[in-house]
């Protein structure tokens, strides 16, 4: 959400969120690495277009004008350069200078190699355990956020995974209008919606560049579940890899699994929309998981089958009015799975993206808690990989990218919530080989084995 | 003045296990990486693994995993090497280093003096 | 793993010559690389990083270049004191493994 050093009185106050760099002359002696070229403090441009009519609440939420309701005022990095105080490179980009181009490329989990998997699971177990070196998260809304005393800035540490796991509950959370009204809950800034893909996108690579720095592995990258199998088993599901199902109780990942020993974040739902409070690195129970287990609902006991990839990606338009889970059509609705894979909405479906989820039947299933079971992370590099191929295909082609009257979030100049420094989706909206330094070892079907560069 | 002092030599039997130390001056611990390098007689030098004295990280090279542990005391300045069910194979000079993150660099920039350690029955 | 292939593994060379040193990787590894310099019974030396980069008080007449797989370390105007072996290593994936490398004898 915001660096540790903007997390206090005086930058809120100021509404000034420019970290220092290296400032050999003192505190904010080199904001944004100004000394040496990096960046400077500019004023933070925010998407003032108009959204659709599904949030009638302006001026309640803090998501609204992302960052604007709490910093005013950022970093702008100059070249390659990024990061809250400018001090690492681009996406893709290395060197003291960031001139140097690198590429990562992000493998189907299957094949990697019995210590290449291994590496990965420890990697994601050190993530849930290892405090976030830059971010912390508010645990009060902006009202609050000064704590009770107006004087004790209301926020915490929290992890490298629940970091992540925790921004995607704030991009999902209802909105709160306060004690005694029930929060508005048809809101939200990374779903349904044109920015589903792009949010998502930098939601993995802030995952993976965290990791790459918790690592010192600058080649380190998060690899992808092929879910388009067809079959009614989850095949990385397995004790080497995610954690297979547990004897005990078939809901729960099995002891062999380090994945068993994982806590949940953000699960009290209830007490964030009736007293108006936000999650916290509190961690609760466990990951619960039983693929093809929803005796009840028969259509998501199987994953999509390897067609569906194929018929989503011959869906030439990337998003149709009016922008939302309805959007018939339209890629980005076809491949979150709210369309047939043909393209063609239909309220009973749930496809792809949709699907895999709710194939999961638990922890995964379920928004605002679904980044707690790590197989998200496969599932949306997956995804994401669907989408880079989309780009290749078709250019790029950002024009029915809605500039406005998409849901509030999905604008295509909006910043995406709550990401820092501020990001817009246009950015997430390039071939990543070419832009954002990764590609994909992918071979779509019918199609030969390629990284998709 | 940067400065990574090791412990003196051991000489250890086979199956037992050691722990070597290597207290820094000069630097602030937790700000680095702090690396362990083997060189066995008249070879090459053989990278061991990191911590990460700020929050008691460690990666190994899956060749060492299981038989090298490294720790840290960040109130002495101290990381230390603890070697299990040592057999002649890693009698060894055993170095500690460390790594300036700053932009990523890529080098381990200064070096301790090195641990002997004889596995000897 | 990236394996490291340094060579050659041995040169002799005069006073006043210039050498050179190479490593190849077994994958790009995009410039993470670092050259050391080892004398007999001492630690290792740090003389070049990001594969280009002098480290400081490093003489002048050693300079790193290379790119992707290939990398090489070049010490002109031999001194004696550069006799000793010398290392390469990468950053770009876990284990950072060495270069077998090469020993240097001033003639």
């Known amino acids: 959400q915001f660096p540790r050093e903007c997390a206090n009185i005086e930058a809120l106050r100021r509404g000034v969120c420019c970290p220092d760099l290296l400032p050999s002359s003192g505190p904010g002696t080199d904001p944004c690495g100004s000394s040496s070229g990096r960046g400077r403090c500019v004023a933070v441009i925010a998407d003032s277009r108009p959204h659709s009519r599904h949030y009638p609440h302006d001026g309640k939420d803090d998501r609204e004008a992302w960052p604007l309701r709490f910093f005013n005022r950022t970093c702008q990095c100059n070249d390659n350069f990024s990061g809250h105080n400018c001090g690492t490179c681009r996406p893709g980009w290395r060197g003291a200078a960031c001139n140097q181009k690198i590429l990562t490329v992000r493998r189907n989990l299957l094949d990697l190699s019995p210590e290449e998997k291994s590496h990965f699971v420890r990697a994601l177990d050190m993530a849930k355990r290892t405090t976030h070196p830059q971010f912390v998260i508010a645990t009060r809304r902006l009202e609050d956020i000064l704590g009770p005393d107006g004087n004790t800035p209301q926020f915490e540490n929290i992890s490298v995974y629940n970091y992540f796991v925790w921004t995607h509950y704030y991009s999902v959370k209802k909105t709160f209008l306060g004690t005694g009204q029930e929060s508005f809950g048809d809101v939200d800034f990374s779903h349904e919606g044109p920015a589903f893909l792009t949010w998502h996108r930098y939601h993995l690579l802030q995952l993976e560049r965290d990791m790459q720095e918790m690592l010192q592995e600058p080649s380190f990258s998060l690899p992808y579940w092929n879910f388009a199998t067809g079959k009614n088993v989850c095949d990385v599901c397995t004790d080497d890899l995610m954690g297979s199902r547990s004897n005990f109780d078939s809901t729960l990942i099995s002891p062999n699994s380090v994945f068993s020993q994982w806590r949940v974040v953000c699960e009290s739902l209830e007490e964030y929309d009736t007293l108006g409070t936000l999650c916290n690195s509190t961690e609760g129970g466990p990951i619960r998981r039983n693929p093809a287990g929803n005796v009840g609902r028969p259509a998501v006991q199987r994953l999509p089958e390897p067609q569906d990839v194929t018929q989503c990606l011959e869906v030439r338009v990337f998003d149709t009015p009016p922008f939302y889970s309805n959007s018939t059509d339209s890629f980005r609705n076809t491949v979150e799975g709210y369309s047939a894979p043909t393209g063609k909405y239909d309220p009973a479906v749930r496809s792809l993206h949709n699907l895999a989820h709710l194939f999961l039947n638990g922890t995964g299933g379920q928004t605002h808690l679904s980044p707690n079971d790590p197989i998200f992370v496969l599932l949306h590099t997956f995804t994401d990989a669907v989408f880079d191929e989309w780009l290749r295909r078709y250019n790029a082609d950002i024009s029915t990218f809605p500039l406005e009257n998409a849901p509030i979030g999905h604008n295509r100049q909006y910043n995406m919530v709550p990401f820092w420094p501020p990001v817009t989706n246009t950015e997430m909206f390039v071939t990543a080989p070419d832009n954002l330094g990764y590609a994909y070892e992918v071979q779509w079907p019918g199609q030969e084995f390629t990284v998709s560069e | 003045e940067v400065q990574l002092q090791q412990s003196g030599a051991e000489l250890v039997r086979p199956g037992a296990l050691v722990k070597l130390s290597c207290k820094t001056s000069g630097f602030n611990i937790k700000d680095y990486f702090l690396h362990w390098v083997r060189q066995r007689p008249d070879q090459g030098l053989e990278w061991i693994g990191w911590i990460n004295p700020d929050n008691g990280n460690t990666v190994y090279d899956p060749k060492f995993q299981g038989t090298a542990s490294l720790t840290a005391d960040t109130s002495s300045n101290t990381v230390y090497l603890q070697l299990s069910g040592l057999t002649s194979e890693d009698t060894a000079v055993y170095f500690c280093t460390r790594r300036d993150y700053t932009y990523e660099k890529a080098a381990l920039d200064y070096w301790g003096q090195g641990t002997t350690v004889t596995v000897s029955s | 793993d990236i394996q490291m292939s340094q060579s050659p593994a041995s040169l002799s060379a005069s006073v006043g010559e210039t050498v050179t040193i190479t490593c190849r990787a077994s994958g790009n590894i995009y410039n993470y690389l670092a050259w050391y310099q080892q004398k007999q019974g001492k630690s290792p030396h740090l003389l070049v990083y990001?594969?280009?980069t002098l480290a400081d008080g490093v003489p002048s007449r050693f300079s790193g270049s290379g790119s992707g797989t290939q990398y090489s370390l070049k010490i002109s105007s031999l001194q004696t004191e550069d006799s000793g072996n010398y290392y390469c290593q990468h950053f770009w994936s876990l284990p950072f493994t060495f270069g077998s490398g090469t020993k240097l004898e001033i003639k």
């Open positions: 990001d594969a280009k």
